[in-house]
C-alpha cells in the first residue's frame, strides 16, 4: 500500500498486536496476565464450555452488529447464567396449568450471587429452546408483577420450524428490578397471543424443559437445556475501578 | 490546540465546510446546487412545512441515535406523507364499530405516486396523534390481510398523559407489500391488547381523526392531524444512479 | 462496503479491512486464555483522500464522497465500522470465568 | 463521553467534538436550502495518543485505553461516534422536496 510514503505493513501489524495486548488487559481491568498456577488440570468444565458457547452463538432475535457502545460498556462484561427453577418445585403448583401459558421461575438469590448490585447489570436475556413447531405461533412474554397479576413485556412471531431453535428475550429492566427488590422467587409467563376476536388461544409451541416422561439420560440433557437467564454484568471489583476513575478527566 | 505542531483551527473549519458542501450535494445526488429561478414567491406551502416538521421532530418510539447505515442508505431519502382516507369514506362502513378497535385505510394509488417501486422504499412509519389518556393502555397494530382477517404487526404500552403525543409505528415491510400488490385500498387496525384472561378490552386511547362533533375550525386542524404514513424513499432518478455506480469499484 | 468479503478478495489500495489473526500463545506469549486459542482481530488501513469539493472534475468528486469522505471530515481517517464482540474463557486462581469483550473483531472499515 | 456536553464546556486538548454552525447562505453561499437556515454540524478534532502497552508505567497506560485507543488501533484517530440526521426543504425547479440527510450532525467523537 502506498500513500505519500510507503506503509510498512509489518510495523502496522506489530503496533496493532501490541495495542491488542493492552486492550484485552484493560477491558478485563487486569494489571498483568493472571497466573495459571492454580488452574485445575484437564479440560474445561462442561458447564463453562456450555456458557462460552451460549455467549459465542448468535440466537434468533439478536442483532449481529452491536450498536456503538456507551463509555461504561467499553469494559468487559462477565457472563453468567441462572437456570430456571425445575418444574417439580412447589412454586409451580400455585399456578393452574392452562393451555395458553407456561411459567418460568427464577431464584433471586442465584441472581444476586451472579450480580450483587442492580447497577452492574448491563444485559439480561431469557433464553428458551423451542422445539419443532408445526404452525406459526404468536407468543407473548409477561413478568410476574404482584400476587396474581402479570405485566406484558414483549412478543414474538414464531415461524414453523423442523429443528429446535434458541429464542432470546431482552429482560434487562425486569432483572434489574428483581435485584432491587427483596423477593425470593420471581417469574415469567409465556402465553399464546390472544386477539380480542379469536377464541383459539392454545400455546402450540413446545419449550424444552416442560415435557415429561423422558428416558433418564435424555431428561438430564433436557434439564440442562431448560430456560435460563443469560446475564452480562460488570464484576464488582471492576465497577469500583470504574467509579473511582470516572471523574478523573 | 497543540499536538507536535499547532493545529490551524480555522483551516480545519474551512476544510470541514468545504467537505460539507460536497457531502450535501452527493447525498442528494445533485451535480450542482439547484437553480432557484422557478421557485414560487412567498413562504413555503403549509403542507411542506408540516412534512418537514414531522421529519424533524422525534416521536415516541423513535431512537435518537441512528445505527450505522448500510451503503445504500448513505444517500438522502425523499420524505412524503399519505394521509389516511377520511372516516366518512364508505370503506369504513364494512367494518363494524367496536369498543376495542379503530380502523385506518390508505389509498394505494397515493402511495404509488409517492413511491413508484417497492424497492425504493427505505422506511414507512404510521403516525398517530394520541390525545390525552387517563389510564395506561396496551395497544396492538394489525394489518388488513385478506377478506376479513388481520395480521398482527406490533404493540405499544401507552403511559397516561395530559398532553397529545405522536405515536410512530414502523410499517416498512407492510407498505412494501402493498406497493407490490394490486389492491386499491389497504388498511390497519389499532386494537386494545386482549389478554387471554382479561375481559376488559376497551380501547381507551383517543386517536386524533376519529372523534366527531367538533367546531368547524377545529375540525380542519383535526383532519390535518389525522393518521398518516410518513414515507422515506430513494427517488427513482437517484436509484438509477445508484444501480449504475454500484459495481464501479 | 469495505468489509471482509470485499477487502480480503481485492487489492484495494485505499481504506479497507486487512486480515490479522491473533494467536494468543504465539503472538502475545499468553497461555492464560483457554478459549478461544486465537481470533481474527483484523485492522483498518489505507488512505481516505480528502475531497476538495471545488475540484474541477466535480461530478467525479461527488461519486467518491460515499467511499472516501462520507462524514465530510476535514481529515478523513480509515477506522472500524462494524465490530463484533469476543467471548473468552480464562481462570482467576482456581475459578474459571467466561467474559465477553466488546468491539474486538473488525468486520468492516469506513472513512470517517 | 466526548460529547457536546463535555467538550463544549471544557478546554480538552485531546480528541473532542468541536462547535461548528453552518449557515447555508453565509458559509456555503447557498440560498437553495429553504429549511433549515443552517445547522450545528460540529466536527471531531484532537490527538489520540498511541498507547504502547509495553510502557513502563503500565497501570497508567491501561487506564488510558478507553479514551485514547479503545479499538486497539495501530494509529488511533479522532472520529465521530454519535451522528444525527438533518431534514431539509429545497426546490428542484418548481417542486418543493423534503429530504432527510443521514449522519450530518456530530454529537460525540471517539478515538478509533
Amino acid at each position: 500500500l502506498s500513500t505519500c510514503k510507503t506503509i510498512d505493513m509489518e510495523l502496522v501489524k506489530r503496533k496493532r498486536i501490541e495495542a491488542i495486548r493492552g486492550q484485552i488487559l484493560s477491558k478485563l481491568r487486569l494489571a498483568s496476565p493472571p497466573s495459571q498456577g492454580e488452574v485445575p488440570p484437564g479440560p474445561l468444565p462442561e458447564a463453562v464450555l456450555a456458557l462460552y458457547n451460549s455467549t459465542r452463538d448468535r440466537v434468533a432475535g439478536e442483532s449481529a452488529e452491536p450498536e456503538p457502545e456507551p463509555e461504561a460498556d467499553y469494559y468487559a462484561k462477565e457472563v453468567t447464567r441462572v437456570l430456571m427453577v425445575e418444574t417439580h418445585n412447589e412454586i409451580y403448583d400455585k399456578f393452574k396449568q392452562s393451555t395458553h401459558s407456561i411459567y418460568m421461575f427464577f431464584n433471586t438469590s442465584e441472581l444476586r450471587e451472579a450480580v450483587p448490585e442492580p447497577v452492574l447489570l448491563s444485559r439480561a436475556e431469557l433464553r428458551l429452546l423451542r422445539l419443532k413447531l408445526k404452525v406459526e405461533q404468536h407468543v407473548e412474554l409477561y413478568q410476574k408483577y404482584s400476587n396474581n397479576s402479570w405485566r406484558y413485556l414483549s412478543n414474538r412471531l414464531l415461524a414453523p420450524s423442523d429443528s429446535p431453535e434458541w429464542l432470546s428475550f431482552d429482560v434487562t429492566g425486569v432483572v434489574r428490578q428483581w435485584l432491587s427488590r427483596g423477593g425470593e422467587i420471581e417469574g415469567f409467563r409465556l402465553s399464546a397471543h390472544c386477539s380480542c376476536d379469536s377464541r383459539d388461544n392454545t400455546l402450540q409451541v413446545d419449550i424444552n424443559g416442560f415435557t415429561t416422561g423422558r428416558r433418564g439420560d435424555l431428561a438430564t440433557i433436557h434439564g440442562m437445556n431448560r430456560p435460563f437467564l443469560l446475564l452480562m454484568a460488570t464484576p464488582l471489583e471492576r465497577a469500583q475501578h470504574l467509579q473511582s476513575s470516572r471523574h478523573r478527566r | 490546540l497543540s499536538t507536535c505542531k499547532t493545529i490551524d483551527m480555522e483551516l480545519v473549519k474551512r476544510k470541514r465546510i468545504e467537505a460539507i458542501r460536497g457531502q450535501i450535494l452527493s447525498k442528494l445526488r445533485l451535480a450542482s446546487p439547484p437553480s432557484q429561478g422557478e421557485v414560487p414567491p412567498g413562504p413555503l406551502p403549509e403542507a411542506v412545512l408540516a412534512l418537514y416538521n414531522s421529519t424533524r421532530d422525534r416521536v415516541a418510539g423513535e431512537s435518537a441515535e441512528p445505527e450505522p447505515e448500510p451503503e445504500a442508505d448513505y444517500y438522502a431519502k425523499e420524505v412524503t406523507r399519505v394521509l389516511m382516507v377520511e372516516t366518512h369514506n364508505e370503506i369504513y362502513d364494512k367494518f363494524k364499530q367496536s369498543t376495542h378497535s379503530i380502523y385506518m385505510f390508505f389509498n394505494t394509488s397515493e402511495l404509488r405516486e409517492a413511491v413508484p417501486e417497492p424497492v425504493l422504499l427505505s422506511r414507512a412509519e404510521l403516525r398517530l396523534l394520541r390525545l390525552k389518556l387517563k389510564v395506561e393502555q396496551h395497544v396492538e397494530l394489525y394489518q388488513k390481510y385478506s377478506n376479513n382477517s388481520w395480521r398482527y404487526l406490533s404493540n405499544r404500552l401507552l403511559a397516561p398523559s395530559d398532553s397529545p403525543e405522536w405515536l410512530s409505528f414502523d410499517v416498512t415491510g407492510v407498505v412494501r407489500q402493498w406497493l407490490s400488490r394490486g389492491g386499491e385500498i389497504e388498511g390497519f387496525r389499532l386494537s386494545a391488547h386482549c389478554s387471554c384472561d382479561s375481559r376488559d378490552n376497551t380501547l381507551q386511547v383517543d386517536i386524533n381523526g376519529f372523534t366527531t362533533g367538533r367546531r368547524g375550525d377545529l375540525a380542519t386542524i383535526h383532519g390535518m392531524n389525522r393518521p398518516f404514513l410518513l414515507l422515506m424513499a430513494t427517488p427513482l432518478e437517484r436509484a438509477q444512479h445508484l444501480q449504475s455506480s454500484r459495481h464501479r469499484r | 462496503a469495505l468489509d471482509t468479503n470485499y477487502c480480503f478478495s481485492s487489492t484495494e489500495k485505499n481504506c479497507c479491512v486487512r486480515q490479522l489473526y491473533i494467536d494468543f500463545r504465539k503472538d502475545l506469549g499468553w497461555k492464560w486464555i483457554h478459549e478461544p486459542k486465537g481470533y481474527h482481530a483484523n485492522f483498518c488501513l489505507g488512505p481516505c483522500p480528502y475531497i476538495w469539493s471545488l475540484d474541477t472534475q466535480y461530478s467525479k468528486v461527488l461519486a467518491l464522497y460515499n467511499q472516501h469522505n462520507p462524514g465530510a471530515s476535514a481529515a478523513p481517517c480509515c477506522v472500524p465500522q462494524a465490530l463484533e464482540p469476543l467471548p473468552i474463557v480464562y481462570y482467576v486462581g482456581r475459578k474459571p470465568k467466561v467474559e465477553q469483550l466488546s468491539n474486538m473483531i473488525v468486520r468492516s472499515c469506513k472513512c470517517s | 463521553a466526548l460529547d457536546t456536553n463535555y467538550c463544549f464546556s471544557s478546554t480538552e486538548k485531546n480528541c473532542c467534538v468541536r462547535q461548528l454552525y453552518i449557515d447555508f447562505r453565509k458559509d456555503l453561499g447557498w440560498k437553495w436550502i429553504h429549511e433549515p437556515k443552517g445547522y450545528h454540524a460540529n466536527f471531531c478534532l484532537g490527538p489520540c495518543p498511541y498507547i504502547w502497552s509495553l510502557d513502563t508505567q503500565y497501570s497508567k497506560v491501561l487506564a488510558l485505553y478507553n479514551q485514547h485507543n479503545p479499538g486497539a488501533s495501530a494509529a488511533p484517530c479522532c472520529v465521530p461516534q454519535a451522528l444525527e440526521p438533518l431534514p431539509i426543504v429545497y426546490y428542484v425547479g418548481r417542486k418543493p422536496k423534503v429530504e432527510q440527510l443521514s449522519n450530518m450532525i456530530v454529537r460525540s467523537c471517539k478515538c478509533s
Epitope: - | 429561478g37 | - | 447557498w30 428542484v92
Partner: antibody, heavy 118, light 107 residues
C-alpha cells in the same frame, strides 16, 4: 448517447407560422424540461421558454408570450416549438436544449435556421 | 431581467496562450453562472456549470471562477480546437439570459 435532433431549415413569409421539432433520444424524455433558445444572425443567444414534458407545464419569456406555442409528444419523445405571426426579425437559428435543474443546458440540438423573408 | 455583459467581444490569441474571458451580471447571481462553446455548424456545448464545475468530458485546461456579479472563464493553454465563440449564461433567475459572446480567433 444523449441526443437532440431538430427538423430542417425553413423559409417563411412574414405573418406565417413555423413549427420546429426536436426529437430526444438516449434518456428518459419526461425527466427533463425542454427549453428553446434562439440566435439571430451575428447576435447572442435569447431564451424563449420551456415545457415540462411530464406535467405539460409551460413558461414563456414575456417577449414571446402569445406568439410562441410549446408542445410535446411523449409517445415519440419529441418537443415542438411553433412561432406565429412571423416578422423578418424572427430570422434566427432556433435551438432546443435539455435543461438541468442546476440552471444550465447540458445538451443542445444542432439548431434549425428559420428565415423570414417576403 | 438580469443583464449579462461579456468581454471582450472578440479576442485574437495563439496556440499555447493563456486566455481569460469575463462576464458581469447586473445583480448577484449566487454562482449560477455557466459557460458554453459554439462552433459553426455544430451543437452548442456546455463547458462549465455553477461557476467552476467542469462538465464531464471537458478538458481540464478549461476552468471557471468568480462570485457575486463577476465571473471568469480561463483556458490555460490554447489548443487549435478551442477557437470558437464562448457564451456565459445566468441560471439564477428567470428569464435565463446570456452574454453577447466572445469570438476567439487565431492570431
Amino acid at each position: 448517447e444523449v441526443q437532440l435532433v431538430q427538423s430542417g431549415a425553413e423559409v417563411k413569409k412574414p405573418g406565417a407560422s413555423v413549427k420546429v421539432s426536436c426529437k430526444a433520444s438516449g434518456y428518459t424524455f419526461t425527466s427533463y424540461d425542454m427549453h428553446w433558445v434562439r440566435q439571430a444572425p451575428g447576435q447572442g443567444l435569447e431564451w424563449m421558454g420551456r415545457i415540462d414534458p411530464q406535467s405539460g407545464g409551460i413558461k414563456y419569456a414575456q417577449k414571446f408570450q402569445g406568439r410562441a406555442t410549446l408542445t410535446v409528444d411523449t409517445s415519440t419523445s419529441t418537443a415542438y416549438m411553433e412561432l406565429s405571426r412571423l416578422r423578418s426579425d424572427d430570422t434566427a437559428v432556433y435551438y432546443c436544449a435539455r435543461y438541468d435543474h442546476g440552471g444550465y443546458f447540458d445538451v443542445w440540438g444542432q439548431g434549425t435556421l428559420v428565415t423570414v423573408s417576403s | 431581467d438580469i443583464q449579462m455583459t461579456q468581454s471582450p467581444s472578440s479576442l485574437s490569441a495563439s496556440v499555447g496562450d493563456r486566455v481569460t474571458i469575463t462576464c458581469r451580471a447586473s445583480q448577484d447571481i449566487y454562482n449560477y453562472l455557466n459557460w458554453y462553446q459554439q462552433k459553426p455548424g455544430k451543437a452548442v456545448k456546455l463547458l462549465i456549470y455553477y461557476t467552476s464545475y467542469l462538465e464531464t468530458g471537458v478538458p481540464s485546461r478549461f476552468s471557471g471562477s468568480g462570485s457575486g456579479t463577476d465571473y471568469t472563464l480561463t483556458i490555460s493553454s490554447l489548443q487549435p480546437e478551442d477557437f470558437a465563440t464562448y457564451f456565459c449564461q445566468q441560471g439564477d433567475t428567470l428569464p435565463w439570459t446570456f452574454g453577447q459572446g466572445t469570438k476567439l480567433e487565431i492570431k
